[in-house]
């Protein structure tokens, strides 16, 4: 039975040209995390594997940095980066947990961080 929950940075906003940290945290389970995938809609951004380290998709290499931790840092943000991002935790024996983050990239300097929220 999957008992874990993923806590994410929730709905967040950031300024165009700036950077943002996408962060998820898996809790309430003793399952072992074997890999975390970061995806933007249906595009793979990065993989962090427990044994093999990081792999950043070539098309994002210039604007994506690994970490902190299992998180992902998006740099040089553009308005086109607005949208849904997913952290997909592959675990044993539970299976897959997915967290969702919505990022809005703003032209102005009124970018605010949303509250953290949980996805069961």
């Amino acid at each position: 039975m999957m008992t874990g929950t993923i806590e994410t940075t929730g709905n967040i906003s950031a300024e165009k040209g700036g950077s943002i940290i996408l962060q998820c945290h898996l809790s309430s389970t003793t399952a072992q995390v074997t890999q975390v995938n970061w995806e933007q809609q249906d595009q793979l951004l990065a993989i962090c594997n427990a044994d093999l380290g990081w792999h950043i998709s070539p098309s994002f290499k210039d604007r994506v940095a690994p970490g902190p931790g299992l998180g992902l840092t998006l740099q040089s943000l553009t308005v086109n980066d607005t949208g849904e991002y997913f952290c997909i935790y592959h675990t044993y024996p539970d299976g897959t947990y997915t967290g969702r983050i919505f990022l809005e990239v703003l032209e102005s300097s009124v970018a605010e961080h949303g509250a953290r929220f949980q996805i069961p």
Partner: antibody, heavy 119, light 107 residues
Amino acid sequence: EFQLQQSGPELVKPGASVKISCRASGYSFTAYSMNWVQQTNGKSLEWIGVINPKFGTINYNQKFKGKATLTVDQSSSAAYIQLNSLTSEDSAVYFCARNGNFAWYFDVWGTGTTVTVSS
Amino acid sequence: DIQMTQSPASLSASVGETVTITCRASENIFSYLAWYQQKQGKSPQLLVYNAKTLPEGVPSRFSGSGSGTQFSLKINSLQSEDFGSYYCQHHYGVPWTFGGGTKLEIK
């Protein structure tokens, strides 16, 4: 104390195979992945591959694919490397070294096994 | 594969001196760099990981710095037990690769 005890030195003929063991003690064997590293002529180090004792997943350095085969035996907390079709270029010291989950550096190293390939 | 270039290849110093070894990565490895010490006929030992973190038991005279592609290991007030070879290794993504090593000898 964490220890990785490796088998003794090997003198083998060209074309033969050799299997080296690495016995873990002092920690939970399946909680850490096991890497193998080659050191030629006391000089630099080359990563051969990694095996996850819990899941049996293996990843090889492209250079050593077909040359090295990694296995584990959970019941005896041992990891093994088999080296095939040996040539003089495979004469080296081979180390096992563990790494933690999402920690890709080697915090405990084996004692090393010298393999000499000579006719 | 990421190439790791270490310099100098060898270095002579006296007890009490401070020395610095550098390591350059062929591409950005952020802070995913480890340093190891190896004495003649022995196994390597972890000195630093994540570019600057010292594992428990490593003396504070060792310090690591750098990020991106340029890294260094500094040893303050050299002790006789510090002589040996030093290797850097990136731990960003497989295959893990090591620098060519720096042999630190007593002057």
